[in-house]
Amino acid sequence: IPAPSIRLVPPYPSSQEDPIHIACMAPGNFPGANFTLYRGGQVVQLLQAPTDQRGVTFNLSGGSSKAPGGPFHCQYGVLGELNQSQLSDLSEPVNVSFPVPTW
């Protein structure tokens, strides 16, 4: 099944202490999906979209960006025929970067 879209939700972090907000959206015909956020292949957080919604926002507290392991991806799962779970492809990566201090 198709990969979700992924994007940072503003405000964008300006330091490692700032929270990070990441939105994942399934295609319109997959509402109520279960979403998983990964960083460098490691599960960061799981969220289920409401039954009438096709997306979620992962809210990560400040300091989450210090964890090693590369960019964020997300994936969603839905129940297919015979109640079997189907997983989507992984989203494109999203990288979190911080402005270079000006002092």
Partner: antibody, heavy 122, light 111 residues
Framework: QVTLKESGPALVTPTQNLTLTCTVS??????????WGWIRQPPGKGLEWIGS???????YYNPSLKSRVTISVDTSKNQFSLKLSSVTAADTAVYYC??????????????WGQGTLVTVSS | QSVLTQPPSVSGAPRQRVTISCSGS????????VNWYQHPPGKAPKLLIY???LLPSGVSDRFSGSKSGTSASLAISGLQSEDEADYYC???????????FGTGTKLTVLG
């Protein structure tokens, strides 16, 4: 049911500082799903976003007001506050506090206070 | 000066349909989702539409939103007297790094 209520002076003298407080009832200010913001409406004009704060203390401000604005949060009192320095008559407005919810892949202001009119005059 | 432009006023008779436009640029509407707020006189603003076209629970389905490129629209069908209010589009502006509201549109229900 979440309610927000603004409190503070109705009249401020030019060059003075304005401090407003928003008290949140019916929900925790410390949820990771919300920012808490201030928005104002000068008489006869439109809505203008002032700035917002996360429960952890992270803030972001309207660039046009940034040099004069400080927003702080007191999670123990379930309150957040706005301080606007060196006010002028142009700061006369109805000031609203509001909750910004992160949900469904985006965000929106879903709960608002009733607003408080602040007049800057000598 | 708002970066989102709306018509100052629109009007319509009861049961008619009106639309309110909101024009921006790539850094705001073009790359970010749009919300709409209803602001009745003397009251707090109320969320009407979020994520371009989604309806919050409790909001009448007479309201609908759409977006194309760097413009967004709010449509109100079956106009009622209680729809009289100011309406604002709102989004994020990546260049300003902040929330922006439209200039606002006053809706008058005739008769």
């Amino acid at each position: 049911q979440v309610t927000l209520k603004e409190s503070g002076p109705a009249l401020v003298t030019p060059t003075q500082n304005l401090t407003l407080t928003c008290t949140v009832s019916g929900g925790s200010i410390s949820s990771s799903s919300y920012y808490w913001g201030w928005i104002r409406q000068p008489p006869g004009k439109g809505l203008e976003w002032i700035g917002s704060i996360y429960y952890s203390g992270s803030t972001y401000y309207n660039p046009s007001l940034k040099s004069r604005v400080t927003i702080s949060v007191d999670t123990s009192k379930n309150q957040f506050s706005l301080k606007l320095s060196s006010v002028t008559a142009a700061d006369t407005a109805v000031y609203y506090c509001a909750r910004r919810r992160n949900s469904s892949g985006w965000f929106y202001f879903d709960y608002w206070g009733q607003g408080t009119l602040v007049t800057v005059s000598s | 000066q708002s970066v989102l432009t709306q018509p100052p006023s629109v009007s319509g008779a009861p049961r008619q349909r009106v639309t309110i436009s909101c024009s921006g640029s790539r850094s705001n509407i073009g790359d970010n989702a749009v919300n709409w707020y209803q602001h009745p006189p003397g009251k707090a603003p109320k969320l009407l539409i979020y994520y371009d076209d989604l309806l919050p629970s409790g909001v009448s389905d007479r309201f609908s939103g759409s977006k194309s490129g760097t413009s967004a629209s709010l449509a109100i069908s079956g106009l009622q007297s209680e729809d009289e209010a100011d309406y604002y589009c709102a989004t994020w502006d990546d260049s300003l790094n902040g929330h922006v509201f439209g200039t606002g549109t006053k809706l008058t229900v005739l008769g």
